[in-house]
Interface confidence: low
């Protein structure tokens, strides 16, 4: 056959679906690889073809669209399972072609099992809620397109294994779950089960996400440098190791890039000749506030090094701060026989 633009196996789109539930999977060509959509392609006379490779097999085979009750079907650029079976796991390929053009991409589909408490190998999306912030909602994800707007599904929400009813501050409101005031105790996995009828059959969609309660932007402050500070002096003798910690607290801020760095005489350590190493450690509070510590180390400090300016800098979306460390050379204790004797005029 003629050459086909093969985008390979798109492992970035590892699709996971639950066993015995409907799944609708869009051909990734139109989402991520081609500059035109399915309608344009279709009206230009291009045909979308689906095939698959079973798990642990090398053989590409056509998808059987003649199963009882149309268990697998295609609609425009969507491959439908009504419902999935465990052995549907494999690599699926969608190919767009006519006599002069061909483009294809493969993607892995994994059908996973869940237990009665919705535990499974499914990778869960994380939804962050601000602590004590007011009413916030999470929405049952990835259910669009499964049923028409005329169908009114029933939605049941669970926290872990427990159905959410009469919870103190969590209220199910159809597709939404409202948190009146999010607290650390609201951390956990939340599942919505959407039940809807279709052609005399009842289908269930199970969607689980992880809720993580994080620091509120109302409480967010610019970075706070705990160390160095005005009270600590780093006093060293030449030849000793100089270690200075830069410890910075960052309020949680959604999508903020937190940065800490040292300058020595106004330059980054990489841009100067002295042998400096920087080690960084990061810790997080329960609400994802961050504390970063960068320890500046000079193994054998010289008297020149002890005259330099060491400044810790920090930056977040809330602002930038800097603090200089107080570094000085230790005045050596006098040795009586030489220094004091000389001081008394002895020879």
């Amino acid at each position: 056959s003629e050459r086909c633009d093969d985008w390979g196996l798109d492992t970035m789109r590892q699709i996971q679906v639950f066993e015995d539930e409907p799944a609708r999977i869009k051909c990734p060509l139109f989402e991520h690889f081609l500059k035109f959509n399915y309608s344009t392609a279709h009206s230009a006379g291009l045909t979308l073809i689906w095939y698959w490779t079973r798990q642990d097999r090398d053989l590409e085979e056509p998808i059987n669209f003649r199963l009882p009750e149309n268990r697998i079907s295609k609609e425009k650029d969507v491959l439908w399972f009504r419902p999935t079976l465990l052995n549907d796991t494999g690599n699926y390929t969608c190919m767009l072609r006519n006599t002069t053009y061909c483009s294809k991409v493969a993607f892995p589909l994994e059908v996973v099992q869940k237990d009665s408490c919705f535990n499974s190998p499914m990778k869960l999306p994380v939804h962050k809620l601000y602590i004590e912030y007011g009413i916030q909602r999470i929405t049952c994800p990835n259910v669009d397109g499964y049923f028409p707007s005329s169908v009114k599904p029933t939605i049941t929400w669970y926290m872990g294994c427990y159905k959410i009813q009469n919870f103190n501050n969590v209220i199910p409101e159809g597709m939404n779950l409202s948190f009146l005031i999010a607290l650390i105790s609201n951390n956990g996995n939340y599942t919505c089960v959407v039940t809807y009828p279709e052609n005399g059959r009842t289908f269930h969609l199970t969607r689980t996400l992880t809720v993580k309660v994080v620091g509120s932007p109302k409480n967010a402050v610019p970075p706070v440098i705990h160390s160095p500070n005005d009270h600590v002096v780093y006093e060293k003798e030449p030849g000793e190791e100089l270690l200075i910690p830069c410890t910075v607290y960052f309020s949680f801020l959604m999508d903020s890039r937190n940065e800490v760095w040292w300058t020595i005489d106004g330059k980054k350590p990489d841009d100067i000749t002295i042998d400096v190493t920087i080690n960084e450690s990061i810790s997080h509070s329960r609400t994802e506030d961050e504390t970063r510590t960068q320890i500046l180390s000079i193994k054998k400090v010289t008297s020149e090094d002890l005259k330099r300016s060491y400044v810790c800098h920090a930056r977040s979306a809330k602002g930038e701060v800097a603090k200089a460390a107080k570094v000085k050379q230790k005045v050596p204790a006098p040795r009586y026989t030489v220094e004091l004797a000389c001081g008394f005029g002895a020879t």
């Epitope: 009413i135 105790s185 109302k218």
Partner: antibody
């Protein structure tokens, strides 16, 4: 200096509506919640609800859900409470009070308005 | 709703003497994050209420240290080590752990 200046006393007939205002100054209006509290003659205090001026989110005591409506005008740093279908039971002093950054003002209300006296009488 | 019960309803005191007010809640005020949102306020005659204490024992700025708040769970106490004339008025405890916020009936501190 933080100040909450409330509108003056009101005399209304039963069945009418009234809108009480609370003008904030001396702080960032959108950084704090505004709470409303009712004090009936010589009695205790009742929390009516609050509003987050930044997002406009409101929270009501169920008892006042159909009675009170809380709004804000960010441009003038003013919070409002409208009371409808007035009866003699609504005669009271109404206070606005600044809540801290917690949505329900959990840690107490650190600044209070001077109060607005509402009398409902035919 | 959480019921806040204050005792006594009236407390007659002598200037310079100590005073103690009790406040009990119908449910624990310890929230799941480990905070207890129990607050005290004072309403002097003809004035608006004023925050005295929040989070059980934290004094509001400008509140003299003769006031102390203590307690946990459902039982709380406000103590004044030596009553002064400016302390007279009605003291309210109130809770902010459970929705809706609720106040005690108040304790009137008056001169004997």
């Amino acid at each position: 200096e933080v100040q909450l200046q409330q509108s003056g006393p009101e005399l209304e007939k039963p069945g009418a509506s009234v809108k009480i205002s609370c003008k904030a100054s001396g702080y960032s209006f959108t950084g704090y919640n505004m709470n409303w509290v009712k004090q009936s003659n010589g009695k205790s205090l009742e929390w009516i609800g609050n509003i987050d001026p930044y997002f406009g989110g409101t929270s009501y005591n169920q008892k006042f859900k159909d009675k009170a409506t809380l709004t804000v005008d960010k441009s003038s740093s003013t919070a409002y409470m409208q009371l409808k279908s007035l009866t003699s039971e609504d005669s009271a002093v109404y206070y606005c009070a600044r809540g801290d950054v917690h949505y329900y003002g959990y840690e107490g209300f650190d600044y209070w308005g001077q109060g607005t006296t509402l009398t409902v009488s035919s | 709703d959480i019921v806040m019960t204050q005792t006594p309803l009236t407390l007659s005191v002598t200037i310079g003497q100590p005073a103690s007010i009790s406040c009990k809640s119908s449910q624990s005020l310890l929230d799941s994050a480990g905070k207890t949102y129990l607050n005290w306020l004072l309403q002097r005659p003809g004035q608006s209420p004023k925050r005295l204490i929040y989070l059980v024992s934290k004094l509001d700025s400008g509140v003299p240290d003769r006031f102390t708040g203590s307690g946990s769970g459902t039982d709380f106490t406000l103590k004044i080590s030596r009553v002064e004339a400016e302390d007279l008025g009605v003291y309210y405890c109130w809770q902010g752990t459970h929705f809706p916020l609720t106040f005690g009936a108040g304790t009137k501190l008056e001169l004997k």
